[in-house]
């Protein structure tokens, strides 16, 4: 049993790291393969992390970490039984994945102007909760062509667009991510998607 | 938020014996040592000894060893530490802490007073 | 054993003025990992100690920036670059490395 690639990390910079790997041949990760990973400078023994599978040859492991900081680095051992397969670390600070925002909502009520809102994904005791900006993506259900990104760059969890910026009459979706500069991350998955039907009135031409 | 709550004042004969609740909530119970620590008054911090809630495995310091019993219940997330034979310099107050960066998490400590 | 060795055991201070405070071990706190395990508390009047350096030089968490670590092997050092008021009561240097022992603490009071 060997290790064809090698297990690389993520952290959502709050409670939860994901690493993935690949084994040279199928493998039962959970009943053959234990991750093991410890602060460290935490002179104790390791925590235990049971990886599921991911593809026939792939695994995946959720390490639970009750918090994180920038100083912050882990030892990461790849056990079968008694025989070590791989020993690495993991600074989760240079490896952020952040959390998804949530309640994405599409407000349309307000004058032909539509206001989305969504959460952040961090409380506010996380240092990622004043560094998040956003990249909001809207598209239309009927025309693959009609697709288009608004960065946020400021912290507010909003965005205000003009209704006329879009075809009225026909339903839109609209979805959001996140990235943090601070850390350099990767993006986070796209949140849900939310949809709504898009209309307003056509201003009055004169002649 | 990490959160170490212990249990109240004792009032122990000497010769008798104390035991001292400290139940955590917050974190991993079993993914960090507790160290218990003792402060006489108006003195220093004198560590006693750790135990591990995930395995119970114990390290008592010198001091304080054939005296000492510390021991968790997972279930409740609570570790406990007993002093026996009490004597009037056991008098301090008793501090469990968790340690991760450092000691990073402390109870709010239990006075032990030691009086015929 | 190691031997922590606080020094001075009392510190007036001026708030807005700077303050330090050393700590000397009998043996090296450099572990073979390249972190020095030297801790610092401060415990104010009827409170549970509080951590505010781990590791030499990391801040913990929500502890301000006016603090912080410095030295390497036996000697540290704590600096508070601005004392305020809140900054009083006793700090304690302690060593991680082998099994706790704790400095004898200095007391900082406002002059």
């Known amino acids: 049993m060997k290790v064809l690639q090698e297990p690389t990390c993520v952290s959502d910079y709050m409670s939860i790291s994901t690493c993935e790997w690949k084994m040279n041949g199928p493998t039962n990760c959970s009943t053959e393969l234990r991750l093991l990973y410890q602060l460290v400078f935490l002179l104790s023994e390791a925590h235990t992390c049971i990886p599921e599978n991911n593809g026939g040859a792939g695994c995946v492991c959720h390490l639970l970490m009750d918090d994180v900081v920038s100083a912050d680095n882990y030892t990461l051992d790849l056990w079968a039984g008694q025989q070590l397969l791989w020993k690495g670390s993991f600074k989760p600070s240079e490896h952020v994945k952040p959390r998804a925002p949530g309640n994405l909502t599409v407000h349309t009520n307000v004058s032909d102007t539509l206001l989305l809102t969504w959460s952040n994904p961090y409380p506010p005791d996380n240092y990622l909760y004043n560094h998040l900006t956003y990249a909001v993506n809207i598209w239309s259900e009927n025309d693959p062509a009609d697709f288009r990104i608004y960065n946020v760059t400021y912290l507010e969890p909003s965005l205000r667009i003009a209704a006329s910026t879009l075809k009225s009459g026909i339903s839109y979706r609209a979805r959001v991510r996140a990235w943090a500069q601070c850390y350099n991350t990767t993006w986070s998955e796209w949140s849900p998607s939310t949809k709504w039907h898009n209309s307003y009135r056509e201003p009055f031409e004169q002649h | 938020q990490v959160q170490l709550v212990q249990s109240g004042a004792e009032v122990k004969k000497p010769g008798a014996s104390v035991k001292v609740s400290c139940k955590a909530s917050?974190?991993?119970?079993?993914?960090?040592?507790i160290y218990w620590v003792r402060q006489a008054p108006g003195q220093g911090l004198e560590w006693m000894g750790w135990i591990n809630p995930n395995s119970g495995g114990t390290n008592y310091a010198q001091k304080f060893q054939g005296r000492v019993t510390m021991t968790r219940d997972t279930s409740i997330s609570t570790v406990y530490m007993e002093l026996s034979r009490l004597r009037s310099d056991d008098a301090a107050v008793y501090y469990c802490?968790?340690?991760?960066?450092?000691?990073?998490?402390w109870g709010q400590g239990t006075t032990v007073t030691v009086s015929s | 054993d190691i031997m922590m060795t606080q020094s001075p055991l009392s510190l007036p201070v001026t708030p807005g003025e700077p303050a330090s405070i050393s700590c000397r071990s009998s043996q090296s706190l450099l572990h073979s990992n390249g972190y020095n395990y030297l801790d610092w508390y401060l415990q104010k009047p009827g409170q549970s100690p509080q951590l505010l350096i781990y590791?030499?030089?990391n801040r913990a968490s929500g502890v301000p920036d006016r603090f912080s670590g410095s030295g390497s092997g036996t000697d540290f050092t704590l600096k508070i670059s601005r004392v305020e008021a809140e900054d009083v009561g006793v700090y304690y240097c302690m060593q991680g490395l082998q099994t706790l022992t704790f400095g004898g603490g200095t007391k900082v009071e406002i002059k």
């Open positions: 917050g974190y991993t119970f079993t993914g960090y040592y």
């Open positions: 802490a968790k340690r991760k960066r450092g000691l990073d998490g």
């Open positions: 590791l030499g030089s």
